[in-house]
């Protein structure tokens, strides 16, 4: 109620002889500041005097503090809030009640605090969780209801008298609510800790023993087992006997059931602590353990690896990789169940031993076609040699080998023949599926690997084929060697280099571009008449009569070829000039007379000149001289001259006779 002073402090404080007491304390006076404070030991109220009697351990007044007990007791408080006290050292006879007599200007109060001082340091108290299970972390707590600033202490944990490695966390409390020192230890107990003694030891600052508390650990755990085997190395041969014994070295609580496991699977009808295996087979090889259960759970022994030894079983071969491409690498693995593992291997290729290969793996760095076939192996260990298994097939794939182009025709081949070629090869894996031909042409392939060339050209020189599976292999080109008649026959003038003039020396050459076979004959002809059989036709002195159309022929064993007709042109000056007269060489006066200058010339006459009987040139320059009307005085001998680019020619005299007409004669 409102008439009380309000105090907060621990109800009882604990200490021991020679230690100290620190009393945390707070208060609130009813009015004003504290004016007087007396600390009594076991105070008793005297009704007669209305005062408290008892030993005064500390006293303070308005006048100041009165020394008491050589300052063993200290008031560490103040006049309105703090009432903390310290007694150092504390003695056995300090046990009892401490009375804090507080007076303010108008109010008084007696606050009681219990002090329990023992003769010797009292033990701490270990607190354990209700159940401890192996491998589950627990916190062990050691609590001591003591703490004092003037008297440092430490709490140490021991397991079977040996300091524990785990780090403990120590905490102290010196508050108005509680005074204690506490050590907490986090700890994962193992089954082997069961029944072991844990101690919390109280020590002074120098590590001197003051007191302790001990507890015995009750660690719940699955059964702990030991397995024993005969023979001890657990290595036996087929037909031998094996005994395994399971021993429980610890179980908390007691075990309830027993079973045996092989490779993690429970063995039926095996529920005793002894497992007898009679006449073992290789299938009984494996990892054995016993399992014993209690309320915590099942416990398993360590595994015993039972090895039933036997000679290698028939082997199998694994190939990486088949089919293999020629030139690639291949690895073979010999697989054979055996115990102990095989120490030696013998490898076979198509039944023949592969020299130098005695390991489990064989590596062929570059596969060749002949490496194809069956690979088998035999494994060997200390107990014997296995049998050769069925083996594995290595398929070696490679491009077609030794490809050739073969001409099926009888030789020689002539231009225009039908040629048949075949593409042959020695071997191929996989099989050849198609063929290619070079050069490409509009040729027919009547069947796979056969090429038919209809009407073969003279210029079909070489043909090559390829046989193809996954790859194409080309044959060397084969020469068709097509035979044909001479080609491109033509006449070529060798000399003279310029135009041919009558009298020149002239040579004509019969040319051709090619011929197969090379041996040829030549023929020259003019107007169907054979002139010569050489490649050249020569004229020592050409005459206009030699002009005309010439052809040459070239023939070989296949046929003959003619050139185009070649015109030989001979240039010459006008010749064979004569004057012809029309209507005749006798003409009546008054009529018309035409004189024509006829000639033979190449090129034709370009210019004519007329002359009379006096060799006088007449003013006429065309081929014809027309006299109209003709007069008697025109009578006489005439001649003409013709000119071309080569030269001139003149005609002989031709006489024109003009006679009088009857009229003239009549007039006369």
């Amino acid at each position: 109620d409102s008439s009380k002073w309000v105090f907060e402090h621990p109800e009882t404080l604990y200490a021991w002889e020679g230690a100290c007491v620190w009393i945390p304390c707070t208060y609130r006076a009813l009015d004003g500041d504290l004016e007087s404070f007396i600390l009594f030991h076991n105070p008793e109220y005297n009704k007669n005097t209305s005062k408290f009697d008892g030993t005064r351990l500390y006293e303070s007044t308005k006048d100041g503090k009165v020394p008491s007990e050589q300052k063993r007791v200290q008031f560490l408080g103040d006049k309105n809030k703090n009432c903390t006290l310290s007694i150092h050292p504390v003695h056995l006879n300090d046990s009892g009640q401490l009375g804090l007599r507080m007076e303010s200007k108008t109010e008084k109060w007696m606050e009681r605090i219990h002090l329990n001082v023992s003769e010797r340091p009292f033990p701490p108290h270990i607190q354990l969780p209700p159940e401890i299970q192996e491998s589950q972390e627990v916190t062990l707590t050691c609590l001591l209801n003591f703490s004092c600033y003037g008297y440092p202490i430490q709490l140490q944990w021991l397991l079977e008298g040996v300091p524990m490695r785990q780090a403990a966390v120590t905490s102290t409390s010196l508050t108005i609510k509680s005074v204690f020192t506490r050590s907490e230890l986090k700890f994962s107990p193992q089954w082997s800790h069961h029944g072991k003694i844990v101690t919390c030891q109280l020590q002074d600052a120098d590590g001197k023993f003051l007191s302790n508390d001990t507890v015995q650990l009750n660690v719940k755990h699955t059964p702990k087992l030991e397995i024993k085997v005969t023979p001890s190395d657990a290595i036996v041969r087929e037909g031998d006997s094996v005994t395994m014994t399971c021993e429980v070295s610890s179980s908390n609580p007691e075990y309830t059931t027993v079973s045996w496991l092989k490779d993690g699977t429970s063995l039926k009808k095996q529920n005793t602590f002894t497992l007898n295996l009679r006449e073992v087979t290789k299938d009984q090889s494996g990892k054995y353990c016993c399992q014993v259960s209690n309320d915590v759970g099942p416990g398993r022994s360590e595994e015993v690896f039972l090895q039933v030894q036997y000679a290698p079983e028939p082997s199998t071969v694994q190939i990486l990789h088949s089919p293999a491409v020629e030139g690639s690498q291949v690895e073979f693995l010999c697989m054979s169940l055996a115990n102990p593992l095989p120490t030696n291997y013998t490898w076979y290729h198509n039944g023949k031993e592969m020299q130098g290969r005695t390991e489990e793996k064989v590596h062929i760095p570059k596969i060749l076609p002949w490496h194809a076939g069956t690979y088998s192996c035999v494994a060997e260990n200390i107990l014997g040699t296995g049998q050769r298994g069925p083996g594995a097939e290595l398929d070696v794939q490679y491009p077609p080998k030794k490809v050739t182009t073969v001409i099926q025709n009888p030789m020689p081949i002539r231009e225009g023949d039908t040629v048949t070629l075949s593409c042959n090869y020695n071997s191929s894996n996989p099989s050849v599926t198609r063929y290619e031909w070079k050069p490409h042409g509009a040729w027919e392939e009547p069947s796979l690997g056969v090429l038919k060339i209809q009407n073969v050209g003279w210029d079909n020189t070489t043909i090559a084929c390829a046989a193809c599976n996954s790859w194409c292999s080309w044959a060397s080109p084969v020469a068709l060697n097509v035979q044909y008649a001479p080609r491109d026959v033509r006449v070529r003038k060798i000399k003279p280099l310029s135009e041919i003039h009558s009298g020149n020396s002239v040579s004509l050459q019969c040319d051709f571009s090619s011929s197969h076979p090379k041996e040829v004959q030549f023929f020259w002809e003019k107007n169907g008449r054979l002139l010569g059989k050489e490649s050249q036709l020569n004229f020592d002195s050409i005459s206009p009569e030699d002009a005309g159309s010439y052809s040459c022929w070239v023939n070989n064993s296949i046929g003959q070829t003619a050139s185009k007709a070649w015109t030989l042109e001979v240039l010459y000056a006008p010749r064979r000039l004569r004057v012809s007269m029309s209507p005749g060489d006798q003409v009546m006066e008054g009529k018309s007379a035409t004189l024509t200058c006829e000639s033979d010339a190449n090129p034709p006459v370009s210019h004519y000149t007329w002359f009379d009987w006096n060799n006088q040139s007449l003013p006429y320059h065309s081929q014809k001289l027309r006299l109209e009307p003709v007069k008697v005085q025109h009578s006489g001998a005439y001649w003409c001259q013709g000119t071309n680019s080569v030269g001139k020619g003149r005609s002989p005299l031709s006489t024109l006779t003009v006679y009088y007409s009857p009229e003239t004669i009549g007039r006369r």
Epitope: G327, G356, R357, E359, I364, K366
Partner: antibody, heavy 122, light 107 residues
Framework: QVTLRESGPALVKTTQTLTLTCTFS??????????VSWIRQPPGKALEWLAL???????YYSTSLKTRLTISKDTSKSQVVLTMTSMDPVDTATYYC??????????????WGQGTLVTVSS | DIQMTQSPSSLSASVGDRVTITCRAS??????LNWYQQKPGKAPKLLIY???SLQSGVPSRFSGSGSGTEFTLTISSLQPEDIATYCC?????????FGQGTRLEIK
Amino acid sequence: QVTLRESGPALVKTTQTLTLTCTFSGFSLSTSGMCVSWIRQPPGKALEWLALIDWDDDKYYSTSLKTRLTISKDTSKSQVVLTMTSMDPVDTATYYCARIRYIYGYDYFDYWGQGTLVTVSS
Amino acid sequence: DIQMTQSPSSLSASVGDRVTITCRASQRISSQLNWYQQKPGKAPKLLIYAASSLQSGVPSRFSGSGSGTEFTLTISSLQPEDIATYCCQQTYSKPITFGQGTRLEIK
């Protein structure tokens, strides 16, 4: 029958490049499974494998000398050439070429040349 | 690289003696081991290939055995013409390597 013959300079100077030719007969290096190798032997010392070339023109070299060696073949001439750069007096040795039988691998050296002594002078 | 170690490095024996030379590989080489004989000033000659196969033309007194890492060359009855240096060679992996050689002489 199979024969191999080494040819090259008897004397080379330090830092020069050595070129050796192995001329062989009785087999073709274009035939699958045929290989030629070079081996050397310093005076009074052990044989040391140098290089190998096979029918496929695959080449293999000694780990310690691979930066200095080049092996090549001329199938038409039935020759294998080895060049070795940066010659040093420690390279003085008899140089052999040998045919390798490739059966299931580069298995053994069945024919050897008579060897050619190369002296490296400083 | 695979190291090949021969022992002994030299040995002396009498005509008719049984002679054994050992070759040890630094790692397993299956049976890909060959033995060569080299006489002074001559090229090596193949005696045994694939650890135990006798090369044609080689006298039958020469034999080879072993696999994995330990190999042996045996001359059953030493003859005067057998005086030479013998060396082993592995072809299991490249680089191909030779042993340092064993010099055999007559007592």
